[in-house]
C-alpha cells in the first residue's frame, strides 16, 4: 500500500531512508536537457522473494536533442558530482553493508539523473532527519518518521526533531546520542 | 495516557517572579520538547518559547528575552517556566504544550499580577 | 516574525453547515501549519498538524487543506460541540505565532 503523502518536512532538516521497502517506487527524473528515454520505464520498483530484493527496471537519460542515443546507466565520476545527494551518500558507505530482510539498498546513480530523487513510500517504511549543515538539533527526540495505517488511511508519524541556527551543524541520530538510533545506519537523502 | 499537569494558580505582586510547572506522564519525557504559551484575558495565544528536555536548550520569544527562564527536571519529567520582573499585563493563563505540533496541552495555570 | 493572518475573527452557523476558516501567513511557510480548537476555560486542542494530517482521534469532518501561504479548515457539518474558538500556528521556525482566532458561535 503506497503512503498517500511525503513524509513531514522538518524545518532546516533532510530526511533519509536506511532501506526501501519492497512496493517502493522511485521515479526515472533526468537532469534539464536529458529526457528517459522512449522504451524505458517511467519508474523504478523493489521487488523481491523471502532472501532477496532488489530495484526492477533500470532508468536511463538521454540527450533531450539527440535521436536514438541511449546513454549508459554507469555514471561518470563528473555526473556524480552534480548529484546533491552525493555529499550526504558518501557519508554513509557504511549503509552499503546492510541488507534488511524485505527492502533494497539505495539504487546507484544513473547518468545525467535529476538533482532530487522523488520516492514512493510504501506502509512501514520509515525515514531518519538530520538537521542540515550550519543547524543543530535545539531538540532530538525520535528523529524519524513512519508511515503507518490508521482507520484505512495511510500517516507518517511526527519526527521530534528541532533545528536551529547556529554554526555547529548536527550529527545523525545514532551518530552522537544512541536513543533515536536506526542502528546508526541512515542512508541516502530522499525528497518525497 | 498522556497527561500534562500544570501547577496551581498564583498571585503576585508587580516586580516579583512566578515559576509554574508542567509535569509529563504517560509518555517518554525526553522524546517530546516543552513549549510554553499564555493567553491574557479574553485574547489569543502567544508563544513565549520551547525547552529540550532532553538536553535543557531553550529559545525564548524576542518579547520576553531577559525575563524568561524555562529548565526541566529530568528525574521528576518536570519542566518549568519562570517569568521575572512581573507587570499587570502578565496576567494571563500560562500553558505548557508538548512537542513539534503541541499535541497535547496542560491544563493551565492562572497568573495574576496585582497590586 | 511571521505574521498568522485570520479570517473571519468570528462566524456565526448552524448546526449541520458547512464552515470554513482561513489562515494567511505572512511568507512561504510550506505546510508547516497546525490548527486548534479552544473552548471557554479549556486548554487548546490540536485538530489538524502539517497543515492537513487530521491528529488522532479528531473527527473527520475537520479537514485542512492549503500550502505556503494560504490555509483552510472545513468543519464539513457542524455539531453543537464544534462551537468554539479556532486557532491556526506555523511551527516553520522560531518564534511560532497564531493567528487572532476565529470565534464560531450558534446562529
Known amino acids: 500500500e503506497l503512503c498517500d503523502d511525503d513524509p513531514p518536512k522538518i524545518t532546516h532538516a533532510t530526511f533519509k531512508a536506511v532501506a526501501y521497502k519492497e512496493g517502493t517506487m522511485l521515479n526515472c527524473e533526468c537532469k534539464r536537457g536529458f529526457r528517459r528515454i522512449k522504451s524505458g520505464s517511467p519508474y523504478m520498483l523493489c521487488t523481491g522473494n523471502s532472501s532477496h530484493s532488489s530495484w526492477d527496471n533500470q532508468c536511463q537519460c538521454t540527450s533531450s536533442a539527440a535521436r536514438n542515443t541511449t546513454k549508459q546507466v554507469t555514471p561518470q565520476p563528473e555526473e556524480q558530482k552534480e548529484r546533491k545527494t552525493t555529499e550526504m551518500q558518501s557519508q554513509m558507505q557504511l549503509a552499503d553493508q546492510v541488507s534488511l530482510p524485505g527492502h533494497c539498498r539505495e539504487p546507484p546513480p544513473w547518468e545525467n539523473e535529476a538533482t532530487e530523487r522523488i520516492y514512493h513510500f510504501v506502509v512501514g517504511q520509515t525515514v531518519y532527519y538530520q538537521c542540515v549543515q550550519g543547524y543543530r538539533a535545539l531538540h532530538r527526540g525520535p528523529a524519524e518518521s513512519v508511515c503507518k495505517m490508521t482507520h484505512g488511511k495511510t500517516r507518517w508519524t511526527q519526527p521530534q526533531l528541532i533545528c536551529t541556527g547556529e554554526t555547529e551543524p548536527s550529527q545523525f541520530p545514532g551518530e552522537e546520542e544512541p536513543q533515536a538510533s536506526p542502528d546508526g545506519l541512515p542512508e541516502s537523502e530522499t525528497s518525497r | 495516557q498522556v497527561q500534562l499537569v500544570q501547577s496551581g494558580a498564583e498571585v503576585k505582586k508587580p516586580g516579583a517572579s512566578v515559576k509554574v510547572s508542567c509535569k509529563g506522564s504517560?509518555?517518554?519525557?525526553?522524546?517530546?520538547?516543552m513549549h510554553w504559551v499564555r493567553q491574557a484575558p479574553g485574547q489569543g495565544l502567544e508563544w513565549m518559547g520551547v525547552i529540550s528536555t532532553y538536553s535543557g536548550d531553550a529559545i525564548y520569544a524576542q518579547k520576553f528575552q531577559g525575563r524568561v527562564t524555562m529548565t526541566v527536571d529530568k528525574s521528576t519529567s518536570t519542566a518549568y517556566m519562570e517569568l521575572s520582573s512581573l507587570r499587570s499585563e502578565d496576567t494571563a493563563v500560562y500553558y505548557c504544550?508538548?512537542?513539534?505540533?503541541?499535541?497535547?496541552w496542560g491544563q493551565g495555570t492562572t497568573v495574576t499580577v496585582s497590586s | 516574525d511571521i505574521q498568522m493572518t485570520q479570517s473571519p475573527s468570528s462566524l456565526s452557523a448552524s448546526v449541520g453547515d458547512r464552515v470554513t476558516i482561513t489562515c494567511r501567513a505572512s511568507q512561504d511557510i510550506s505546510n508547516y501549519l497546525e490548527w486548534y480548537q479552544q473552548k471557554p476555560g479549556k486548554a487548546p486542542k490540536l485538530l489538524i498538524y502539517n497543515a492537513k494530517t487530521l491528529a488522532e482521534g479528531v473527527p473527520s469532518r475537520f479537514s485542512g487543506s492549503g500550502s505556503g501561504t494560504d490555509f483552510t479548515l472545513t468543519i464539513s457539518s457542524l455539531q453543537p460541540e464544534d462551537f468554539a474558538t479556532y486557532y491556526c500556528?506555523?511551527?516553520?521556525?522560531?518564534?511560532?505565532?497564531f493567528g487572532q482566532g476565529t470565534k464560531l458561535e450558534i446562529k
Open positions: 504517560g509518555y517518554t519525557f525526553t522524546d517530546y520538547a
Open positions: 504544550a508538548r512537542g513539534v505540533t503541541f499535541d497535547y
Open positions: 500556528q506555523h511551527h516553520y521556525d522560531t518564534p511560532y505565532t
